[in-house]
């Protein structure tokens, strides 16, 4: 009995034409939604003039269907038992699952002003930037529609910059008609314990963003894991969204549509400072904003974002140190709503339900050369938005899963 099931599982989770895993891997049968909450700034003038705390009010959800496109350029390499692919990006707005439209307006940090002042610290260049910011009538904050903020707009300030810079700005620009990868993953033919584990990303085994082991590409992409998952395991996975590998640990048994699954969560330890968790020392890349690497709960991914001062955190600065959120009013971190989890069917290693939550923030610093940043008296890590990307196995698929996998075992 058990040996036969193990044999069947080992055969069916291999990533090659004809297996159950491959069919679902090429194009996920699960509907995946990405919900956005935008942090609408309530007091832009007070912040700019008096360096007040930023008062934010989250507005959302604004929901998009994502990851509905099949993997592209799928190429098996029998020599090293890998399969490579591109994951195309696409997002379709779902009005019925949203509180408003893509034309809704938000007061947010001026992304270009914050980024340019960080990318060009040279004081004389900042004097020039100041001229262009003023000439374009830009300010520290701006009003943008949801569509502009997420998917891109032509920035009036950057349009004046005499250097060859991209004038398009957006939190996820460019997104539609782009692809993530190339990923090269083990197909499991030679060793099922390696199935779906990433061998290389963009042709490399490391990222070139971090020092030491922090730079490694570990584990899978979290859509699945090698079969026969144990509760004691630490599940490693790589997320290109956060430009790093991370891990999840077992939290509880969950019954998902009649299927027993293991809930794995990202522990607070993964977001700790090197003081609390020495393993994280190589994720601390600068000493000033991080207060000599004592701050926690935010990750500086500027190296991965062409030098733009992007910081990733959990929503509402969950698991972050008090100094990070002390400049922001209106945040209410809540573990249930704001943590990330994966519900994994342990026999196959398939992720049958997940909620990936993350917040995108931008650093803005005082600059005595740039008038709109001149009156700031401190650094701000400004929350722009947070997202909740979720997927749950459909009822039909769950039924099939129960009959073909869990039913046979029970």
């Amino acid at each position: 009995g058990d040996m036969l099931i193990q044999k069947t599982i080992k055969k069916e989770v291999v990533l090659e034409e004809g297996t159950i895993a491959f069919k679902n891997w090429v194009k996920t049968g699960t509907e995946i939604y990405r919900q956005f909450w935008i942090f609408d700034v309530q007091n832009p003038q007070e912040v700019m003039m008096n360096s007040s705390n930023i008062q934010v009010k989250q507005r959302g959800p604004y929901t998009y269907r994502v990851r509905f496109l099949a993997k592209e350029n799928i190429t098996q390499d029998p020599k090293d038992n890998t399969v490579s692919f591109l994951q195309p990006n696409g997002a379709i707005f779902e009005p019925s699952l949203s509180v408003g439209t893509e034309a809704d307006n938000f007061t947010v940090l001026n992304l270009a002003v914050a980024a340019a002042s960080h990318i060009y610290p040279n004081p004389f260049v900042q004097v020039v930037l100041n001229s262009l910011i003023n000439k374009s009538k830009s300010s520290m904050f701006q009003v943008r529609t949801l569509r502009e903020l997420l998917w891109g707009y032509t920035d009036p300030f950057l349009s004046l910059v005499p250097y060859p810079v991209s004038t398009r700005v957006g939190m996820f620009y460019p997104y539609n008609n782009t692809a993530d990868g190339v990923y090269k993953v083990f197909n499991g033919k030679d060793s099922i314990s390696k199935v779906a584990i990433i061998d290389t990303y963009k042709g490399k085994r490391n990222l070139s963003y971090w020092e030491s082991y922090c730079d490694m590409i570990n584990g899978t992409d979290a859509a699945s894991f090698p079969p026969f998952v144990e509760k004691s395991q630490v599940l490693q996975f790589f997320s290109s969204d956060i430009c790093r590998s991370i891990y999840a640990v077992f939290e509880s048994d969950v019954n998902l549509k009649g299927i027993p699954v293991y809930r794995f969560v990202l522990p607070s330890k993964a977001f700790a400072s090197p003081v609390q968790n020495p393993d994280n020392h190589c994720f601390c890349t600068e000493k000033i904003i991080s207060k000599n690497c004592t701050s926690y709960g935010v990750l500086d991914i500027s190296k991965c974002k062409e030098g733009k001062p992007v910081y990733i955190s959990l929503p509402h600065f969950l698991y972050a140190s008090p100094d990070v959120s002390e400049t922001i009013d209106g945040l209410n971190p809540n573990e249930e709503e704001h943590r990330t989890y994966l519900d994994i069917e342990p026999i196959t290693g398939f992720t049958l339900q997940f909620a990936k939550r993350l917040q995108v923030n931008l650093l803005v610093k005082p600059s005595n050369k740039i008038q709109v940043l001149k009156r700031l008296k401190r650094n701000y890590i400004v929350p722009i938005l947070w997202l909740n990307e979720t997927g749950t196995i459909g009822d039909e698929k769950a039924k099939m899963f129960r009959s073909q996998v869990t039913g046979k075992i029970n």
Epitope: V128, S131, K135, K374
Partner: antibody, heavy 116, light 107 residues
Framework: QVQLQQPGAELVKPGASVKLSCKAS????????MHWVKQRPGQGLEWIGE????????NYNQKFKGKATLTVDKSSSTAYMQLSSLTSEDSAVYYC?????????WGQGTTLTVSS | DIVLTQSQKFMSTSVGDRVSVTCKAS??????VAWYQQKPGQSPKALIY???YRYSGVPDRFTGSGSGTDFTLTISNVQSEDLAEYFC?????????FGAGTKLELK
């Protein structure tokens, strides 16, 4: 069209002070930092300092601290540079230049002659 | 302060020639260098910023190059109106400093 009006010449006695003016037009005066540069006859250019007309915040070349004082009058869109305790070493052409894409617009300069 | 050395005070050229004016910085200034042209009795005119970018309206016979400590302004096909003094300037750090100038004159 950016225009910078500077008096053509000033003649002053050693030990005295002088206030050179630079009247700007053709752009929003408070939006652009104003720089001042000195050029002695047959010699190179020396940067004196800069001022932000929006709040009168000024930065100086250490060499000119105590010698030059930069101010602005927003109402008349005019930048000023006061030079004190004048000596023959201060005889030079003084240029004002607002920073747009760089030092890309210079006034015609004021020739200061310090002589008894 | 960063010192900019323009080793040649004068350079002789003929109309149609190609001429290179050099500027050496006492320390690394990246590409934070500008070039200016000054004719007698006139104020300086900006030609190049960021070592190699031409200001709008500047003829394309003017080319800037270099990074770190060594910079060059090249004028290809010299015209009579190009006979002037040329200054380099660094804006990598304050105080801003200028080279002593190179005067271009007819042979």
């Amino acid at each position: 069209q950016v225009q910078l009006q500077q008096p053509g010449a000033e003649l002053v006695k050693p030990g005295a002070s002088v206030k050179l003016s630079c009247k700007a037009s053709g752009y929003t005066f408070t939006s652009y930092w104003m720089h001042w540069v000195k050029q002695r006859p047959g010699q190179g250019l020396e940067w004196i300092g800069e001022i932000d007309p929006s709040d009168s915040h000024a930065n100086y070349n250490q060499k000119f601290k105590g010698k030059a004082t930069l101010t602005v009058d927003k109402s008349s869109s005019t930048a000023y540079m006061q030079l004190s305790s004048l000596t023959s070493e201060d005889s030079a052409v003084y240029y004002c230049a607002p920073i747009h894409y760089g030092l890309d617009n210079w006034g015609q300069g004021t020739t200061l002659t310090v002589s008894s | 302060d960063i010192v900019l050395t323009q080793s040649q005070k004068f350079m002789s050229t003929s109309v149609g020639d190609r001429v290179s004016v050099t500027c050496k910085a006492s320390q690394n200034v990246g590409t934070n260098v500008a070039w200016y042209q000054q004719k007698p009795g006139q104020s300086p005119k900006a030609l190049i910023y960021s070592a190699s970018y031409r200001y709008s309206g500047v003829p394309d016979r003017f080319t800037g190059s270099g990074s770190g400590t060594d910079f060059t302004l090249t004028i290809s096909n010299v015209q009579s109106e190009d006979l002037a003094e040329y200054f380099c300037q660094q804006y990598n750090s304050y105080p801003l400093t200028f080279g002593a100038g190179t005067k271009l004159e007819l042979k």
